[in-house]
């Protein structure tokens, strides 16, 4: 099949006191190989500070996956989610406060 770029969506949720979990989800992409990882101040986070979901079919002939990490509340602006798929790449910030989901379709 032809390349379908992912929709990337960054969300935040409350974790323990003073911390939040930020999750970067990529969906509706093809082929299945995708890089999704968190950066702090432009530097990649180590594997042991991130959690990944498996790359799974989403039922439409495309795939979905996610990566999450726990950060200190108030430091959201230092973190970005990096996505690389089929030679294209993009970075996605953490939404501030209780804002809505941020969807970015990468072309």
């Amino acid at each position: 099949g032809s390349t379908v770029p992912p929709m990337v969506n960054v969300t935040r949720s409350e974790a323990s006191e003073g911390n939040i979990t930020v999750t970067c989800r990529a969906s509706s992409f093809y082929p299945r190989n995708i890089i999704l990882t968190w950066r702090q101040d432009g530097v990649s986070l180590s594997h042991d500070t991130q959690q990944w979901g498996d790359v799974l079919p989403d039922g439409n002939g495309t795939y979905q996956t996610w990566v999450a990490t726990r950060i200190c509340r108030g430091e959201e602006q230092r973190f970005t989610c990096y996505m690389e798929h089929s030679g294209n790449h993009s970075t996605h910030p953490v939404p501030s406060g209780n804002s809505h989901h941020h969807h970015h379709h990468h072309h």
Partner: antibody
Framework: QVQLKESGPGLVAPSQSLSITCTVS????????VNWVRQPPGKGLEWLGM???????DYNSALKSRLSISKDNSKSQIFLKMNSLQTDDTARYYC??????????????WGAGTTVTVSS | DIQMTQTTSSLSASLGDRVTISCSAS??????LNWYQQKPDGTVKLLIY???SLPSGVPSRFSGSGSGTDYSLTISNLEPEDIATYYC?????????FGGGTKVEIK
């Protein structure tokens, strides 16, 4: 067919800088990370750093102050520059493609390496 | 940095033998471990990734296992072309670090 080939000066004088080029074929640099790894004579492997598809870089903190990695996507080339070389920088320098998929991160294809000797 | 230790620096075995190479990390690395083979001419090849996954083209006589801090590479039936030095490598924390290598020779 994925290939990487390093080219370097061979001999570098102490305190001088080192420049090595890695020329790749069979894949696009916009969609793959490339790593630099070195191996001193008779010793093990040491990761120096990497450059991502978007040009962002990560470095081994022990060498970060002396290292710079850059690339030219159109020429399919990655460049390693290291300053203030000393004799213990004598090593074989490898570039290797990185595959970074979720829980999996590995160097799936390596160049043959280029030998750099630091000596006056 | 995480220290990777391969306590056996060299070993001799006969063709057809089962060979096991051990690798220990200075802290838990959550299966974030790869194995590489370096031939006498310096050529490096990926053998095993993520503890036990075999890349395409690598013979099935190679296998990997382990968890926590202790990992191993097994060659089930030693062949002449397996004469090489084998390195483990962790990527749980940056920087990725390698073991000192285990050289396999023919008895």
């Amino acid at each position: 067919q994925v290939q990487l080939k390093e080219s370097g000066p061979g001999l570098v004088a102490p305190s001088q800088s080192l420049s090595i080029t890695c020329t790749v074929s069979g894949f696009a640099l916009t969609g793959s990370g490339v790593n630099w790894v070195r191996q001193p004579p008779g010793k093990g492997l040491e990761w120096l750093g990497m450059i991502w598809g978007d040009g962002n870089t990560d470095y081994n903190s022990a060498l970060k102050s002396r290292l710079s990695i850059s690339k030219d996507n159109s020429k399919s080339q990655i460049f390693l520059k290291m300053n203030s070389l000393q004799t213990d920088d004598t090593a074989r320098y490898y570039c290797a493609r990185g595959a970074h998929y979720g829980k999996r991160w590995y160097f799936d294809v390596w160049g043959a390496g280029t030998t750099v000797t630091v000596s006056s | 940095d995480i220290q990777m230790t391969q306590t056996t620096s060299s070993l001799s075995a006969s063709l057809g033998d089962r060979v096991t190479i051990s690798c220990s990390a200075s802290q838990g690395i959550n299966n974030y471990l790869n194995w590489y083979q370096q031939k006498p001419d310096g050529t490096v090849k990926l053998l095993i990734y993520y503890t036990s996954s075999l890349p395409s083209g690598v013979p099935s006589r190679f296998s990997g296992s382990g968890s926590g801090t202790d990992y191993s590479l097994t060659i089930s039936n030693l062949e002449p072309e397996d004469i090489a030095t084998y390195y483990c490598q962790q990527y749980s924390k940056l920087p990725p670090t390698f073991g000192g290598g285990t050289k396999v020779e023919i008895k």
